[in-house]
Interface confidence: low
């Protein structure tokens, strides 16, 4: 066959859909690979062709668009399943072509089973709510395009296994779920089930997301350096190991990049000739406030190293702070034999 621009298997778009539910899958060519949309391609005389490779098979097959009740159909650049079956899992290819042009991309589609509590291998999106911040809402995701605006679906919300009814601070409002005042106890998986009729059949769309209650911006502060501090002096003799922890607390801030770094005599450790290593650990509170610890380590410190300036720096979207560690050389203990000899006036 003639040459075709093959974008390969687009594993970045691992599509997961639930068994026995409708699924609409757009050809990724127009979304991520080509600079024109389907309408432009169609009016230019290009044809969109779909085919697939079943799970654990190598053979590319045409998609059967003549199944009962049009279970699989194509509409413009969308492949429709009404509904999916477990054995629809496989790699799907959409190819755009005419006599002179050809471009195609494949993507994996996984049809996933869920249990009666909506547990499944589906990767769940995470929605963060601020703790005690006032009314916040989550919206049932990825249901656009499944039914016309004239159809009024029924939406039922669940927390874990339980239908949300008479919850104290969580109120279903159609496609939205309102949290009157989010608390740690609201952490969990929330599922909306959208039910709509189509041609005498009832279809369900199940969408689960994870709610994580996080620190409120009202309570956010600039980074706080707990260590080094003024109360601890790092006194070492040459040849000993010098260990200085820099421990910084960061309030949770949406999309903020938290950074901690050391400088030695105003330079990054990488720019200095001494043999220094830095190990980092990170821990999180229940509301995703972050504590970062960077331990600066010099295995065999020299007297020169003990005269240097060691400063811990921290930065977040709330600001930048720095704190110097108090480092000094240990004064050797008096050597009594010499002192006594001098005291007796030996000549």
């Amino acid at each position: 066959s003639e040459r075709c621009d093959d974008w390969g298997l687009d594993t970045m778009r691992q599509i997961q859909v639930f068994e026995d539910e409708p699924a609409r899958i757009k050809c990724p060519l127009f979304e991520h690979f080509l600079k024109f949309n389907y309408s432009t391609a169609h009016s230019a005389g290009l044809t969109l062709i779909w085919y697939w490779t079943r799970q654990d098979r190598d053979l590319e097959e045409p998609i059967n668009f003549r199944l009962p009740e049009n279970r699989i159909s194509k509409e413009k650049d969308v492949l429709w399943f009404r509904p999916t079956l477990l054995n629809d899992t496989g790699n799907y290819t959409c190819m755009l072509r005419n006599t002179t042009y050809c471009s195609k991309v494949a993507f994996p589609l996984e049809v996933v089973q869920k249990d009666s509590c909506f547990n499944s291998p589906m990767k769940l999106p995470v929605h963060k709510l601020y703790i005690e911040y006032g009314i916040q809402r989550i919206t049932c995701p990825n249901v656009d395009g499944y039914f016309p605006s004239s159809v009024k679906p029924t939406i039922t919300w669940y927390m874990g296994c339980y239908k949300i009814q008479n919850f104290n601070n969580v109120i279903p409002e159609g496609m939205n779920l309102s949290f009157l005042i989010a608390l740690i106890s609201n952490n969990g998986n929330y599922t909306c089930v959208v039910t709509y009729p189509e041609n005498g059949r009832t279809f369900h769309l199940t969408r689960t997301l994870t709610v994580k209650v996080v620190g409120s911006p009202k309570n956010a502060v600039p980074p706080v350096i707990h260590s080094p501090n003024d109360h601890v002096v790092y006194e070492k003799e040459p040849g000993e190991e010098l260990l200085i922890p820099c421990t910084v607390y960061f309030s949770f801030l949406m999309d903020s990049r938290n950074e901690v770094w050391w400088t030695i005599d105003g330079k990054k450790p990488d720019d200095i000739t001494i043999d220094v290593t830095i190990n980092e650990s990170i821990s999180h509170s229940r509301t995703e406030d972050e504590t970062r610890t960077q331990i600066l380590s010099i295995k065999k410190v020299t007297s020169e190293d003990l005269k240097r300036s060691y400063v811990c720096h921290a930065r977040s979207a709330k600001g930048e702070v720095a704190k110097a560690a108090k480092v000094k050389q240990k004064v050797p203990a008096p050597r009594y034999t010499v002192e006594l000899a001098c005291g007796f006036g030996a000549t």
């Epitope: 026995d20 039922t156 039910t195």
Partner: antibody, heavy 124, light 107 residues
Framework: QVQLVESGGGVVQPGRSLRISCAAS????????MHWVRQAPGKGLEWVAI????????YYVDSVKGRFTISRDNSKNTLYLQMNSLRAEDTAVYYC?????????????????WGQGTMVTVSS | DIQMTQSPSSLSASVGDRVIITCRAS??????LAWFQQKPGKAPNLLIY???TLRSGVPSRFSGSGSGTDFTLTISSLQPEDVATYYC?????????FGQGTKVEIK
């Protein structure tokens, strides 16, 4: 307690009409989808019709389409089945059953509450 | 429309026996399947929904399994009060078809 009570059954001639009712109590009727199910003498169960909590969706088994109409009056906590052009094969005990909360297509609750049934006999 | 086929149509077993009733859907219905018990002259009673979830108050000797097209209802130790007709029902979409029923009797 949660209860469904059917009424309005009786003997009716073929071609005639009959309306049966189902009175709900003990739960928030307006929040639930409702169904009619029938059982001919000595036979199995046959699902007849569904109506969503807000009447936005109704569906019927093929054998009654165009003849039967399911409706509800949420202010009276009552479900109805209007049966027109009755046939001998419509003879059955008619049960109403509660569907899913908020009418979500009996997603996981199935038909958890049933009435005791009302007998409809179509005979000349 | 999806057809539901139950087997056997009737069975006779001794008290304490393990009883298995199967239900097959003509197309996949995921786990949208319920099992009902109906005693003579009474309304059906929901035993199991979502294929395997035991309804509150139903004895634990009843259990359900399966997904897709093949489902089973198991009574682990048959009791005299279990004499009844058992129906499966699919409820993924209308019509909410029932199986034809399985009549369970004591030997």
């Amino acid at each position: 307690q949660v209860q469904l009570v059917e009424s309005g059954g009786g003997v009716v001639q073929p071609g005639r009409s009959l309306r049966i009712s189902c009175a709900a109590s003990g739960f928030t009727f307006r929040s639930y989808g409702m169904h009619w199910v029938r059982q001919a003498p000595g036979k199995g169960l046959e699902w007849v019709a569904i109506i969503w909590h807000d009447e936005s969706y109704k569906y019927y088994v093929d054998s009654v389409k165009g003849r039967f109409t399911i409706s509800r009056d949420n202010s009276k906590n009552t479900l109805y089945l209007q049966m027109n052009s009755l046939r001998a094969e419509d003879t059955a005990v008619y049960y109403c059953a509660r569907g899913d909360y908020y009418g979500s297509g009996s997603y996981y609750d199935a038909f958890d509450i049933w009435g005791q049934g009302t007998m409809v006999t179509v005979s000349s | 429309d999806i057809q539901m086929t139950q087997s056997p149509s009737s069975l006779s077993a001794s008290v304490g026996d393990r009883v298995i009733i199967t239900c097959r859907a003509s197309q996949g219905i995921s786990n949208y399947l319920a099992w009902f018990q109906q005693k003579p002259g009474k309304a059906p009673n929901l035993l199991i929904y979502a294929a395997s979830t035991l309804r509150s108050g139903v004895p634990s000797r009843f259990s359900g399994s399966g997904s897709g097209t093949d489902f089973t209802l198991t009574i682990s130790s048959l009791q005299p009060e279990d004499v009844a007709t058992y129906y499966c029902q699919k409820y993924n979409s209308a019509p909410y078809t029932f199986g034809q029923g399985t009549k369970v009797e004591i030997k």
